[in-house]
């Protein structure tokens, strides 16, 4: 017999061919010998099966000889035997119904772990290979668990259901919340203004939480909190904030900060968190500021950086219009009576420039 | 809920092929046949054909030989090609659902056939 | 092809006016026959089915009978928002017809 695999709630033609292409007497039977329709003149009837007001048949192509039974909104109890009775012979057709759903909300936290149930009839032994948007393969039985998700999770998940050397696909859609980047760093010169800028990786229709920056300051023994927020319907609205400094807050997404001016005692970390709700966890976003300053003090040019940088970035003192260069791994480079001219301190890594400050050098007489 | 969303281009010469795209979301896909229907500027409906997702096609005998009709089930989407476009072609088109009757359909394109 | 003949092709009423609109199909198409409403700029709906069910979510003072050849729909009290074009459309074999349309305008 056939074997025809369906989806819960979906829809599933049975098909049912007569030899000869004109209209004839037909009975949709279970495997209980329960009628669920046939034909009676050219009216189609429906017996007394449980299945009768979802089945239907398309009479436009019983002409063709063909008698399909269709079935809407499949449940996994509508997995059975079907006979079709035409023409003198019966043909069956086994369908099975599958459903597969996760077992939470389908919108997590990264970090969280993701659970995908098999519902399958009684009977059955089917198998799930499921594949991520980012391509990740996971196989599993009747249930298939991804331990900790990760922002390219986010998307559509297709997962293949087997038996019978028959398939059918389900469609799963998984939103990882997140920000669009686990870490961000912001290079400044001293007193420039900053804007910090935390973008979501997902779009909800209602967003609503709370959340918080704390700042360890490079300078500083302890963390403090900056600023605590509200977001209300994607409205942002300040709670709380410091004296020092005094950020300011956009009142829309993407979260964005601005600290009026980058000064070496800000320069360090700090890691934004949002709570949102009806959610379990915080999303996190790690930020960092470096803060450039070059300064000339009677003989001494000096140029500094604040803030977390990695150990191969290379500081340099470098003359304009000339070969003159001090480099340095470090956070400091100074030159000793440097020479009259345009001064250009440089913080690169592996010759991409991330911060530049031009300091005057005026003749001393 | 089950909506179709159709595109395609609206502005043809004669002897053009109309090409015409329809997606179905929030619903089953199999199970069901995919309609094309069409209705010249005041006047009635025509259908024109079908296809299910297994790409089994049913079309007017009218049409026939200048209709192709496709499926591309990966997407959800189902496409009509009418070839050697007239001024008679001109119409509003519609994709629709239908099992016996058309239960669901896209919001129709306008194609003008026009030298 | 099966020929669908709708009349009248327009109707003149009032609102809370009964209004009945024909449908004959030739030849007999049993109880394959569809009612559906179209609006100006808008796709058709359906109303009825199998001739005399009415599809879920249209009020019910549109109402449809008849088998074989000739089926009827029947608005019991018109409201302003009826005033539309009005198709029948058989089911029973291919190519599936539609009648030419009535129009119900304003009186």
């Known amino acids: 017999k056939k074997v025809v695999l369906g989806k819960k709630g979906d829809t599933v033609e049975l098909t049912c061919n007569a030899s000869q292409k004109k209209n004839t007497q037909f009975h949709w039977k279970n495997s209980n010998q329960i009628k669920i329709l046939g034909i009676q003149g050219l009216f189609l009837t429906k017996g007394p099966s449980k299945l009768s007001d979802r089945a239907d048949s398309r009479k436009s192509l019983w002409d063709q000889g063909c008698f399909s039974m269709i079935i809407k909104n499949l449940k996994i109890e509508d997995s059975d035997t079907y006979i079709c009775e035409v023409e003198n012979k019966k043909e069956e057709v086994e369908l099975l119904v599958f459903g597969l759903t996760a077992n939470s909300d389908t919108h997590l936290l990264e970090g969280q772990s993701l659970t995908l149930t098999l519902e399958s009839p009684p009977g059955s032994s089917p198998s799930v290979k499921c594949r991520s948007p980012g391509g990740k393969n996971i196989q599993g039985g009747r249930t298939i668990s991804v331990p900790q998700l990760e922002r390219q999770d986010s998307g559509t998940w297709t997962c293949t259901v087997s038996q019978d050397q028959k398939t059918v696909e389900f469609k799963i859609d998984i939103v990882v919340l997140a920000f669009q980047k686990a870490s961000s760093t912001v290079y400044k010169k001293e007193g420039e203004q900053v804007e910090f800028s935390f973008p979501l990786a997902f779009t909800l229709e209602k967003l609503t939480g709370s959340g918080e920056l704390w700042w360890q300051a490079e300078r500083a023994s302890s963390s403090k909190s900056w600023i605590t927020f509200d977001l209300k319907n994607k409205e942002v609205s300040v709670k709380r904030v410091t004296q020092d400094p005094k950020l300011q807050m956009g009142k829309k997404l993407p979260l964005h900060l601005t600290l009026p001016q980058a000064l070496p005692q800000y320069a360090g970390s700090g890691n934004l968190t949002l709570a949102l709700e009806a959610k379990t966890g915080k999303l996190h976003q790690e930020v960092n500021l470096v803060v450039m300053r070059a300064t000339q003090f009677q003989e001494n040019l000096t140029c500094e950086v604040w803030g977390p940088t990695s150990p191969k970035l290379t500081l340099s003192l470098k003359l304009e219009n000339k070969g003159a260069t001090v480099s340095k791994q470090a956070k400091a480079v100074w030159v000793l009576n440097p020479e009259a001219g345009m001064w250009q301190c440089l913080l690169s890594d592996s010759g991409q420039v991330l911060l530049e400050s031009n300091i005057k050098v005026v003749p001393t007489w | 809920q089950v909506q179709l969303q159709q595109w395609g281009a609206g502005l043809l010469k004669p002897s053009e092929t109309l090409s015409l795209t329809c997606a179905v979301s929030?619903?089953?896909?199999?199970?069901?046949?995919w309609s094309w229907i069409r209705q010249p500027p005041g006047k009635g409906l025509e259908w024109i054909g079908e296809?299910?997702?297994?790409?089994?096609?049913n079309c007017n005998p009218s049409l026939k030989s200048r209709v192709t009709i496709s499926v591309d089930t990966s997407k959800n989407q189902f496409s009509l090609k009418l070839s050697s476009v007239t001024a008679a072609d001109t119409a509003m088109y519609y994709c629709a659902r239908v099992l016996n009757f058309f239960d669901y359909w896209g919001q129709g394109t306008l194609v003008t056939v026009s030298s | 092809d099966i020929q669908m003949t709708q009349t009248p092709s327009s109707v003149s009423a009032s609102v809370g006016d009964r209004v009945t609109i024909t449908c004959r199909a030739s030849p007999g198409i049993s109880n394959w026959l569809a009612w559906y409403q179209q609006k100006p700029g808008k796709a058709p709906e359906l109303l009825i089915y199998a001739a005399s069910s009415l599809q879920s979510g249209v009020p019910s003072r549109f109402s449809g009978s008849g088998s074989g050849t000739d089926f009827t729909l029947t608005i019991s009290s018109l409201q302003p928002e009826d005033f539309a074009t009005y198709f029948c459309q058989q089911a029973n074999s291919f190519p599936l017809t539609f009648g030419g349309g009535t129009k119900v305008e304003s009186k």
């Open positions: 296809i299910n997702h297994s790409g089994s096609t």
């Open positions: 929030g619903g089953s896909f199999s199970g069901y046949y």
